[in-house]
Interface confidence: medium
């Protein structure tokens, strides 16, 4: 009986439906390979329900297994550009707390101008995810070409 | 108490588990870049539980945040074909109602013969999703090479 | 009332939250194109909640529609390596029971060194999923470059 009532009274966030989809805000200064993200209905189709942004990086608010996905498209790019500037690599990882720092997802562009992937991974409340783009090419800020998101899947 | 009883009595669709996975039916006539999809157990491993097809395009029946995913493989393709016929681009977007028209996901083939990606996006009842393949190359109709689907994630 | 009580008493697995994320263990002997997977918290960020491993292949324990995803990166690879060793192809399929054998997802590497994709597909208890890598190139065992997983989505 208690569970049924709880379901009726609690907001969606307490049912574990944490989810976020972010769009690129800007790249970091020269020695900082991180991409800086933004989200919210005023910005288009990006949103944060549960997770939060901390200086452009995504911070998790609920323990659980998450589906993490990303697509990054390089801005002024052809297959010859991409191969000439190789290696250009995108890595998604936990960057803080430092004790949990790990790379979760890594892809190189080789002769392509877009990478896209997804994976399931356990994340804990307080984990901050960083997306590092190494190389000299710049990412597109078009919201249908570059995006990053997480979806809570189960405890 | 009411919630528990509702859960027992309502079909899955009313719990918000809308989901669809489609296979390619055919390409459009020459000036129509849209791919036309089909789904249903008689056709193999494709299905529609909630969303519907409207003249080969996917129409959403329930408001919510969806995971949209797609893979398209070109039919006669090598890396040289792909680069010679560049740009070949795949875009997934809301094409109707016109007031909500927007591109959600866009990828170019460059020197590759397959694109695959996914993203989270809010969709509303009545939104119709179109998948536009621009360029002169044709998609494979093999069901393990070309497919398109959506999964309701949360309200 | 019964549903609410059941929810309180049953473990997560009985709510249908089957999920697995695997890392590469090893490749098969010369005539066996299958990749052999492993999972478990002792191995890093891989896990099995519901599905099981049977001689390195993933066996499903619950009927339903699943999101299947994979990323495979070739180990010592550049775009010239990839094109010189073409065709290198990755296929994910049901390999047993033999009566249900079918290819679910197929990608070629062409001039790239990583493939990544995902799809929704119905799977039944007892289905075993195999991932076949054909060609002469070897996959990377880095856990952020090569992984394979499934997530139960709905009945």
């Amino acid at each position: 009986q208690r569970f049924a009532q709880a379901q009726q009274q609690l907001p969606l966030e307490s049912l574990g439906w944490d989810v976020a989809e972010l769009q690129l805000n800007h790249t970091g200064p020269q020695q900082d390979p991180r991409l800086y993200w933004q989200g919210g209905p005023a910005l288009g189709r990006s949103f944060l329900h549960g997770p939060e942004l901390d200086k452009g990086q995504l911070r998790i608010h609920r323990d659980g297994i998450y589906m993490v996905h990303i697509q990054v498209t390089l801005a002024i790019c052809s297959s010859t550009t991409a191969s000439r500037h190789h290696p250009t690599t995108l890595a998604v990882g936990i960057c803080s707390p430092a004790s949990r720092s790990i790379s979760l997802l890594r892809l190189s562009f080789h002769q392509g101008c877009t990478i896209a992937s997804q994976r399931l991974t356990p994340l804990a409340r307080g984990d901050t995810l960083c997306t590092n783009l190494t190389g000299t090419l710049l990412p597109s800020r078009n919201t249908d070409e570059t995006f990053f998101g997480v979806q809570w899947v189960r405890p | 108490q009411r919630f528990a009883q509702a859960q027992q009595q309502l079909p899955l669709e009313s719990l918000g588990w809308d989901v669809a996975e489609l296979q390619l039916n055919h390409t459009g006539p020459q000036q129509d870049p849209r791919l036309y999809w089909q789904g249903g157990p008689a056709l193999g491993r494709s299905f529609l539980h909630g969303p519907e097809l409207d003249k080969g395009q996917l129409r959403i029946h329930r408001d919510g945040i969806y995971m949209v995913h797609i893979q398209v493989t070109l039919a006669i393709c090598s890396s040289t074909t792909a680069s010679r016929h560049h740009p070949t681009t795949l875009a997934v977007g809301i094409c109707s109602p016109a007031s909500r028209s927007i591109s959600l996901l866009r990828l170019s083939f460059h020197q590759g013969c397959t694109i695959a990606s996914q993203r989270l996006t809010p969709l509303a009842r009545g939104d119709t999703l179109c998948t536009n393949l621009t360029g002169t190359l044709l998609p494979s109709r093999n069901t393990d090479e070309t497919f398109f689907g959506v999964q309701w994630v949360r309200p | 009332q019964r549903f609410a009580q059941a929810q309180q008493q049953l473990p997560l697995e009985s709510l249908g939250w089957d999920v697995a994320e695997l890392q590469l263990n090893h490749t098969g002997p010369q005539q066996d194109p299958r990749l052999y997977w492993q999972g478990g918290p002792a191995l890093g960020r891989s896990f099995l909640h519901g599905p099981e491993l049977d001689k390195g292949q993933l066996r499903i324990h619950r009927d339903g529609i699943y999101m299947v995803h994979i990323q495979v990166t070739l180990a010592i690879c550049s775009s010239t390596t990839a094109s010189r060793h073409h065709p290198t192809t990755l296929a994910v399929g049901i390999c047993s029971p033999a009566s249900r054998s079918i290819s679910l997802l197929r990608l070629s590497f062409h001039q790239g060194c990583t493939i990544a994709s995902q799809r929704l597909t119905p799977l039944a208890r007892g289905d075993t999923l195999c991932t076949n890598l054909t060609g002469t190139l070897l996959p990377s065992r880095n856990t952020d470059e090569t992984f394979f997983g499934v997530q139960w989505v709905r009945p």
Partner: nanobody, 119 residues
Amino acid sequence: EVQLVESGGGMVQAGGSLRLSCAASGKPFSFYFMGWYRQAPGKQRELVALITGDGMTNYADSVEGRFTISRDNAKNTMYLQMNSLKPEDTAVYYCYADVWAGAGRDEYWGQGTRVTVSS
């Protein structure tokens, strides 16, 4: 059921031309992808040309600019015009149709016609 019957194969000198035909019967002709595969001795079957119901075409790199695929929906026939033939074009050429039937996807193949190009 779809039946596909090829004709037009034969022997030809390098640099010469041949025109293959594929007559289809048994289903509406205009809505499926059709194409030509070939298989050379000891090699895998490869798709060399593809055409849609409304005439969009694609070619393998090895034949682009030399081969032309076309179809005549009124006659339920597809063609492959092969010019500037090379010895490496020697193969058995198969007509192919890809159609959705009520019970799922069907792929149909002809019995093949042999093309031999001598140098």
